[in-house]
Interface confidence: low
Amino acid sequence: EAHKSEIAHRYNDLGEQHFKGLVLIAFSQYLQKCSYDEHAKLVQEVTDFAKTCVADESAANCDKSLHTLFGDKLCAIPNLRENYGELADCCTKQEPERNECFLQHKDDNPSLPPFERPEAEAMCTSFKENPTTFMGHYLHEVARRHPYFYAPELLYYAEQYNEILTQCCAEADKESCLTPKLDGVKEKALVSSVRQRMKCSSMQKFGERAFKAWAVARLSQTFPNADFAEITKLATDLTKVNKECCHGDLLECADDRAELAKYMCENQATISSKLQTCCDKPLLKKAHCLSEVEHDTMPADLPAIAADFVEDQEVCKNYAEAKDVFLGTFLYEYSRRHPDYSVSLLLRLAKKYEATLEKCCAEANPPACYGTVLAEFQPLVEEPKNLVKTNCDLYEKLGEYGFQNAILVRYTQKAPQVSTPTLVEAARNLGRVGTKCCTLPEDQRLPCVEDYLSAILNRVCLLHEKTPVSEHVTKCCSGSLVERRPCFSALTVDETYVPKEFKAETFTFHSDICTLPEKEKQIKKQTALAELVKHKPKATAEQLKTVMDDFAQFLDTCCKAADKDTCFSTEGPNLVTRCKDALA
């Protein structure tokens, strides 16, 4: 229904706390360089204005759209051009072009320092002094670094953060209470960020239909007892929610997500028997819980998929009468039978089925032509299954760090032109798939591995789009989202690459490395490894292992030495010489 004042409507629906949080996230995602204080001031002004509209919907400007109100606020910021360059040109446009312009200027890799966590005592002090400001800083810092973070989910993580601080700041040993818990939230939030970015990419590049297909597959796996009409309704609603969040309409997105959660909890009987635990929780926890609820038990009486989609003599007629509905039903029926497949794989199978019908239904004897379609799925299914087996075996053999290094070598050979920091970030993220997925039961491994890899590779594509340097990467990133992972997996050594000159300074280290946290040390070593591969793309695994072992031993020796600086300055050049010899 239409409301006289959109901003009053959203303020009433969401309540002041969530309203303020979402407006802060929206501003931080649009203007990523502004300080917290600048944004907090704008948020307060918008909130005060919303309250006047709640009191009187006919008050001046209350009838304006949220894009107009928010855009006007952002465009009124002083020194916009000095700080944001051409983003200031957006302010010369009218809505909806102005909002589109802001969206296009979102930076997936902003040049901001890493979000450093203060030490426990300081954190607890500032949290106790002003919990609201503390949480505001958290929302601001995460949102500006992740401009597509799913806003209602970020509110959930802020709530988690709040609960952890409330609990741990009351303990004697704050540090050991906070560190593992906050690390856990950070890890989950980072995964949530890349997954949501993938959804927004799907929406931006391929439209709502592509996202809806993803949603149908995912929901059918989770809710195999829901009928197609129910799955279609949920997929349609979920598509709307995600479209709004990806489009910067965060108040509408959060409001509609709450509505969807409410609908699911009111209709458990026709959706799933596993929802009750989630539905007993308060709003943010409920919606989060529903988004990762376990799969319902599959119905026992499901007929073979072939009955309707291969053996029925009227397949082509059914397909011609309602193509999207027929293909949607195929995706639904196949997905509900295969919770053990990744969504990417299910979408590839649906695509193959569609291509087969397009070809066969134009022939003289369609049933003879499409009769073998399910058998033709076999290689498509085997490929990711083999990928999972090979990579999980390797992970079990090498551990996370060793597995990351193996991936780093592989990907540097595939795309040596890509910048070393991007390769290291990608390899570290791809390598985490082992810890995340390889320990799961067999039937959960494939969906976990492939859908996670797809999300990480989407980030690789986004970063590469900014400064395209590798034809290999461009080729894989230009195709459809579901084909990306197989495309990257199939890449081999880039034969067109001219090896990098050997520069001694790239492999020169100083004693300051010794005091770095373990993660930073690993990144330094992995940076050196990528540079080695760029120098010798065809180096064997044995050669690279020799060099890296030597390097690790050198660091270990010098970091234990009484005079670290002398050790680094004398042993360093010897290491460089040995590296060159080993790779010659």
Epitope: A229, P303, A307, D308, D312, A322, G328
Partner: nanobody
């Protein structure tokens, strides 16, 4: 378990109309794919019309398209077949059939329907 009970059959002249009903119990009719089949004396059972589970997408045999209309009333848990411009070759026992598992697609294959009514006879003759 779904029980189906047809009614509405009878004798009608060529060009006339009849409306068959199929009352379902044991499961909501909108949760299953439902169809009408018919069997003329000495012939095989053939698909007439079907409607998908959950979404009202309808399918018809070529021989009845434009003359017959399948519909359902969820509040009464009943399936209907409105038959207009009847011909002598429409004479047969008409059966109502249901498929659980809520499939959208109504198959033309009789074997895929586990639940059947006892049938109602339609005779078209002058």
């Amino acid at each position: 378990e779904v029980q189906l009970l047809e009614s509405g059959g009878g004798l009608v002249q060529p060009g006339g109309s009849l409306r068959l009903s199929c009352a379902a119990s044991g499961r909501y009719i909108d949760e299953t794919a439902v169809a009408w089949f018919r069997q003329a004396p000495g012939k095989e059972r053939e698909f007439v019309a079907g409607i998908g589970g959950g979404v009202d997408i309808t399918y018809y045999a070529d021989s009845v398209k434009g003359r017959f209309t399948i519909s359902r009333d969820n509040s009464k848990n009943t399936l209907y077949l409105q038959m207009n411009s009847l011909r002598p070759e429409d004479t047969a026992v008409y059966y109502c059939a249901a498929r659980p598992g809520k499939p959208l697609i109504t198959s033309k294959v009789a074997d895929l329907y586990p639940y059947w009514g006892q049938g109602t006879l339609v005779t078209v003759s002058s």
